[in-house]
């Protein structure tokens, strides 16, 4: 029972990663920032992994897409293969995981092939999970390092004057989503691969225990004696026979007080 | 690198009208927001007006109800129309042009500047 909720929790917690992953990759708001300001109208600018927008205080909005831009940054491309593979990733093992739940019945499904395939889910969540977290880590840090390196200065270029404006910017929402999305995926993961555990069937041999009357080589199964419950096909209390047969692991047995003569 | 091109400066008379234009040309993501600045003789660089991309527009007080800033956004043009000229408005005109970069700081550059002067 423990099992099977915690294979049911990692998959549902898996999923919620999962959708929040795919929702931070589409977001616009990966970081924002004030592009202009004066006392009547402010421009402010949210971007995200593909495309640009700006938002004037009057109301006008209007976004446009990197596709038009030469030279993106190489770590722009990073972080979107990175969320990419983590949505990728993760979508497949969804999918592996849904097959893999206890509480679904395909066929005549072993244990075994359910264990495995939830440790493979598992794995991929958590593989997922830290795309996600790697690849807005990596994003933050862009940022972060974009604006320090450009501190205002001033250089003539062709046509007259070039000046880099330092402007406040802040961590977008999406960042926050893709952080919080990617380590519930991971620990959905976590979750499954635990669970797998659980649902991993045990090599357990259950060995008759062999007891001897003193003097005789005869061995009595377990259930040999039975009380008087009625039950059973041994309600008269007869001896059954076992022919001296003995476990593997049993070398030699010696008489205890608890032998029954 | 963003080229820009200012034209219509020349000498006025007083009480006279005139059109500057600044053209934005090269490779840049977007313009955000377009402007004329102004330097006389002697003095700092002054704010005349500004306009966003979506038309907001602002005029310094000294400008104000006597020039008219207007862009073509396809263009990337902006125009600075001034009327009821004065003395006091003699100066180099600069066309100021802020470009988003992404993931980046924006740029501001400016033109050369065209000469305004206002004399009978």
């Known amino acids: 029972m423990a099992v099977t909720a915690c294979q049911g929790l990692g998959f549902v917690v898996s999923l919620i990663g999962i959708a929040g992953i795919i929702a931070a990759t589409c977001m616009d708001q990966w970081s924002t920032q004030d592009l202009y300001n004066n006392p009547v109208t402010a421009v402010f600018n949210y971007q995200g992994l593909w495309r640009s927008c700006v938002r004037e205080s009057s109301g006008f909005t209007e976004c446009r897409g990197y596709f038009t831009l030469l030279g993106l940054p190489a770590m722009l491309q990073a972080v979107r293969a990175l969320m990419i593979v983590g949505i990728v990733l993760g979508a497949i093992g969804l999918l592996v995981s849904i097959f893999a739940l206890k509480c679904i019945r395909i066929g005549s499904m072993e244990d075994s092939a359910k264990a495995n395939m939830t440790l493979t889910s598992g794995i991929m969540f958590i593989v997922s999970g830290l795309c996600a977290i790697a690849g807005v880590s990596v994003f933050a840090n862009m940022l972060v390092t974009n604006f320090w390196m450009s501190t205002a200065n001033m250089y003539t270029g062709m046509g007259g004057m070039v000046q880099t404006v330092q402007t406040r910017y802040t961590f977008g929402a999406a960042l926050f989503v893709g952080w919080v999305a990617g380590g519930l995926t991971l620990i959905g993961g976590v979750m499954m691969c635990i669970a797998c555990r659980g649902l991993a069937p045990e090599e357990t041999n259950y060995k008759a225990v062999s007891y001897h009357a003193s003097g005789h080589s005869v061995a009595y199964k377990p259930g040999g004696f039975k009380a008087s419950t009625g039950f059973g096909s041994n309600t008269k209390n007869k001896k059954i026979y076992d022919g001296g047969a003995r476990t593997e692991d049993e070398v030699q047995s010696y008489p205890s007080k608890h032998d029954y003569v | 690198e963003v080229q820009l091109v200012e034209s219509g400066g020349g000498l006025v008379q007083p009480g006279g009208s005139l059109r500057l234009s600044c053209a934005a040309s090269g490779s840049f993501f977007r313009i955000v927001a377009m402007g004329w600045y102004r330097q006389a003789p002697g003095k700092g660089r002054e704010l005349v007006a500004t306009?966003?991309?979506?038309?907001?527009?602002y005029y310094a007080d000294s400008m104000k109800g006597r020039s008219t800033i207007s862009r073509d956004n396809a263009k990337n043009t902006v125009y600075l129309q001034m009327n009821s000229l004065k003395p006091e408005d003699t100066a180099v005109y600069y066309c100021n042009v802020r470009v988003e970069v992404p993931f980046m700081q924006p740029n501001d550059y400016w033109g050369q500047g065209t000469l305004v002067t206002v004399s009978s």
């Open positions: 306009i966003t991309r979506g038309g907001s527009t």
